[in-house]
Amino acid sequence: GELETSDVVTVVLGQDAKLPCFYRGDSGEQVGQVAWARVDAGEGAQELALLHSKYGLHVSPAYEGRVEQPPPPRNPLDGSVLLRNAVQADEGEYECRVSTFPAGSFQARLRLRVLVPPLPSLNPGPALEEGQGLTLAASCTAEGSPAPSVTWDTEVKGTTSSRSFKHSRSAAVTSEFHLVPSRSMNGQPLTCVVSHPGLLQDQRITHILHVSFLAEASVRGLEDQNLWHIGREGAMLKCLSEGQPPPSYNWTRLDGPLPSGVRVDGDTLGFPPLTTEHSGIYVCHVSNEFSSRDSQVTVDVLDPQEDSGKQVDLVSAS
């Protein structure tokens, strides 16, 4: 006869491990008992369980409640056992020693490999600001056994670097993603992808990039100066900018206080019916936590009568 087992049994942390040991005997041969022991190098054999044809299953106190025989029906030549709820400390070498009649004793060894799936964590780097050089966007760490693979999935252009730390029964892998921040990256996803044989599918953690910036400010509303004449209603100036975080707007007049009746509504400055008093230099001040910008325009409110008079003069002068 001969023993049938596996060289390696692989199980995920917390699952049950079946340790196979089957005696393929000639007809008439019987298995008296099967002794299972842990036999890691440098240490004596530690009893796991004894399956006896008459006495039944004896489980070592160290494994009480964790070792069982596979459910019926059972073949009397099958000395396999189930190790419940495998933990990392169970990883190692195991031996089954089979006592048969009349052929004698046989033994076989197997290695139990306990996969410890990683629980990845993603840590964003320092605040990203436009104008910075190469900057850490995020780091992703995953610890498991064996060492997990950590990669990045993103449309953003950047560079990655990885390092690994080996522990007694596992390895931690950290990958960093560096980039040169630009406003076009704002809102873009940066996904850490962790692969491991103990995972049914890759684990993904997504971080949304936030790049602080503030665009140049400009003022709209003076495109047609002829519209800015005395008596005109609904005249307004709008300050244009964009930023992250979204900026706030403030309006001032360079050559004095804002005239009465002028309404400030965020990025918009609304005028009452225009008078010459509204002529002046207006400043839009745009700011966020990252920066501030100014844009100024000169408003010249025209008097139509003056203009037409001047026009006549010009005509007569010609």
């Epitope: 008992q33 002794a35 022991a37 054999a45 009893e47 004894l50 006896h52 008459k54 006495y55 039944g56 299953l57 004896h58 070592s60 106190p61 020693r97």
Partner: antibody
Framework: EVQLVESGGGLVQPGGSLRLSCAAS????????MSWVRQAPGKGLEWVSR????????RYADSVKGRFTISRDNSKNTLYLQMNSLRAEDTAVYYC????????????????WGQGTLVTVSS | DIQMTQSPSSLSASVGDRVTITCRAS??????LAWYQQKPGKAPKLLIY???SLQSGVPSRFSGSGSGTDFTLTISSLQPEDFATYYC?????????FGQGTKVEIK
């Protein structure tokens, strides 16, 4: 024929010592685990100690730990129990018995017993 | 330690009676259970090992059953020489422990 014959019992004062012997014959003595089991007058059976075939890992009942020592001499086919600091509650018939080692520290039932030797601890 | 609880502690029966003695372990012991017979002034004698296996030379009127925690010794037809004290013993763990015994007396 398997035979186990105990000797060495007798009357001893509290605090005294006694050494019991068990002579074995009719089987491969060195291939079996050997135990001492005692029975106080009118009481039930109480396991005392066991020694493995290879003379390693002697085991003791809590009630005798530190006072009794089990040993064997496979060349003489003899099992011993050295009893020190004896107490009145150690008064009993002491039996030796054999059991087959299955594996590790797991044994069969004791299939053969000696006739016993009486130890009386009294002042 | 594993406690072995035997019942009854004594019983009276007549020759030819069917006698049943039970033994309960405080935790599972698979079939690591033996039954012994002891007569006054004599050493215990192994009757049943592995809960249900008859020791060589023991009459077939003795039988054992059970596994785990609950075990039974049955004497199918009591004979005069069967009047004795019967003990169960577990040897699943160290220390091995005995039941308190069941004395079978003549009615």
């Amino acid at each position: 024929e398997v035979q186990l014959v105990e000797s060495g019992g007798g009357l001893v004062q509290p605090g005294g010592s006694l050494r019991l012997s068990c002579a074995a014959s009719g089987f491969n003595f060195g291939g079996y685990g050997m135990s001492w089991v005692r029975q106080a007058p009118g009481k039930g059976l109480e396991w005392v100690s066991r020694i493995s075939p290879g003379d390693s890992t002697p085991r003791y009942a809590d009630s005798v730990k530190g006072r009794f020592t089990i040993s064997r001499d496979n060349s003489k086919n003899t099992l011993y129990l050295q009893m020190n600091s004896l107490r009145a509650e150690d008064t009993a018939v002491y039996y030796c018995a054999r059991a087959e080692l299955l594996a590790f520290d797991v044994y069969t039932a004791s299939d053969y017993w000696g006739q016993g030797t009486l130890v009386t601890v009294s002042s | 330690d594993i406690q072995m609880t035997q019942s009854p502690s004594s019983l009276s029966a007549s020759v030819g009676d069917r006698v049943t003695i039970t033994c309960r372990a405080s935790q599972g012991i698979s079939s690591y259970l033996a039954w012994y017979q002891q007569k006054p002034g004599k050493a215990p004698k192994l009757l049943i090992y592995a809960a249900s296996s008859l020791q060589s030379g023991v009459p077939s009127r003795f039988s054992g059953s059970g596994s785990g925690t609950d075990f039974t010794l049955t004497i199918s037809s009591l004979q005069p020489e069967d009047f004795a004290t019967y003990y169960c013993q577990q040897h699943y763990t160290t220390p091995p422990t005995f039941g308190q015994g069941t004395k079978v007396e003549i009615k």
